[in-house]
């Protein structure tokens, strides 16, 4: 495949990323599959600017990103660390709170109204942001 | 009401060190990251540091890294500031300040605490 | 680190007046940007933040705009109370710099 040299329209650049802000509600499987489908995957947010960036644009709406503990230990949908890696978590999260009567916990997370993250019901339809690196191989076939 | 009080300053001489405290009341502390700013006789506003608020994550200003150290105790409602190595350019007035955290601006702030670094 | 100026550093301007101070990063900060207000020997207050949200309590003739690099504190009529320094601050990437200032007084 090429590399990526800019982004596909209607995505947003930042710091040699690609960024597409959805608009409308999935489960979290959903939107993961979604992502992927664009040769790209759920957020991953790395530092203190990504989460800046990504909260300016999503506003006070819960959003889905790339991170969830459905095996267990919480994972990064694309393998960053998650131990040594950047978190914001909101005060007393994430609870894997059992109480919604959904049946099971919290095993997936998302963008509060405030930024800060939460755990929730991955069945919840929330808005999800798609990540893509630049720098990144593209799967598609090369022009002839 | 939300109130910060800060303590813990003093005269002290170049190269020693001081521990700066602010006591919070009339919020949940343990909600809320913290932040250090000074301000020098007659100088503008720097901001210092940051600590999350659950301790986990913490960011100084260039001016302050490996000789300062933030740190909170939630069971005590208590902010932290320890200084090691002060300098004389390190005399100042030491203000806490609470963190709003989506815009990570500071809401609520101390009256300040006047630390002088002489000989 | 993102630098931050402010013009003009004082400026002078009779009661009633319309007054702007500007602010300017060094490089994007997307809306990531805090006003703030000193009065000689108190803390400093804040007054705006993400560039142009009005905290509660703060009077209607402060309003902040800008994105990016450069912002805007306007003070639609200048009153006795808003003689102070006024301080901007960038708050999207650590550490959380200040410009230096702008001084008010009374014409």
């Known amino acids: 495949g090429s590399e990526r040299t800019c982004c596909p329209v209607n995505w947003v650049e930042h710091e040699r990323s690609c960024y597409w802000f959805s608009r409308s509600g999935k489960a979290w499987a959903d939107a993961d599959n979604y992502c992927r489908l664009e040769d790209a995957h759920l957020v991953v947010v790395t530092s203190w600017e990504e989460q800046k960036f990504v909260q300016h644009h999503i506003g006070p709406v819960n959003t889905w990103m790339g991170l969830h503990d459905q095996n267990g230990p919480w994972k990064w949908v694309d393998g960053t660390d998650y131990e040594t890696g950047f978190k914001n978590w909101r005060p007393e999260q994430p609870d894997d709170w059992y109480g919604h009567g959904l049946g099971g916990g919290e095993d997936c997370a998302h963008f509060t109204d405030d930024g800060r993250w939460n755990d929730d019901v991955c069945q919840r339809p929330y808005r999800w942001v798609c990540e893509t690196e630049l720098d990144k191989a593209s799967q598609e076939p090369p022009l002839l | 009401q939300v109130q910060l009080v800060e303590s813990g300053g003093g005269v002290v001489q170049p190269g020693r060190s001081l521990r700066l405290s602010c006591a919070a009341s009339?919020?949940?502390?343990?909600?809320?990251?913290m932040h250090w700013v000074r301000q020098a006789p007659g100088k503008g506003l720097e901001w210092v540091a940051v600590?999350?608020?659950?301790?986990?994550?913490?960011y100084y200003a260039d001016s302050v890294k490996g000789r300062f150290t933030i740190s909170r105790d939630n069971s005590k409602n208590t902010l932290y500031l320890q200084m090691n190595s002060l300098r004389a350019e390190d005399t100042a007035v030491y203000y806490c300040?609470?963190?709003?955290?989506?815009?990570?601006?500071?809401?609520?702030w101390g009256q300040g605490t006047l630390v002088t670094v002489s000989s | 680190d993102i630098q931050m100026t402010q013009s003009p550093s004082s400026l002078s301007a009779p009661v009633g007046d319309r007054v702007s101070i500007t602010c300017r990063a060094s490089?994007?900060?997307?809306?990531?940007l805090n006003w703030y207000q000193q009065k000689p020997g108190k803390a400093p207050k804040l007054l705006i933040d993400?560039?142009?949200n009005l905290q509660g309590g703060v009077p209607s003739r402060f309003s902040g705009s800008g994105s990016g690099t450069d912002f805007t504190l306007t003070i639609s009529s200048l009153q006795p109370e808003d003689f102070a320094t006024y301080y901007c601050?960038?708050?999207?990437?650590?550490?959380?710099?200040f410009g230096p200032g702008t001084k008010v007084d009374i014409k």
């Open positions: 300040a609470r963190d709003r955290a989506y815009s990570s601006s500071s809401d609520y």
């Open positions: 009339g919020f949940t502390f343990s909600s809320y990251a």
């Open positions: 600590i999350w608020f659950d301790g986990s994550d913490k």
């Open positions: 490089q994007n900060i997307i809306n990531y």
């Open positions: 993400v560039a142009s």
């Open positions: 601050q960038q708050s999207y990437s650590t550490p959380f710099t």
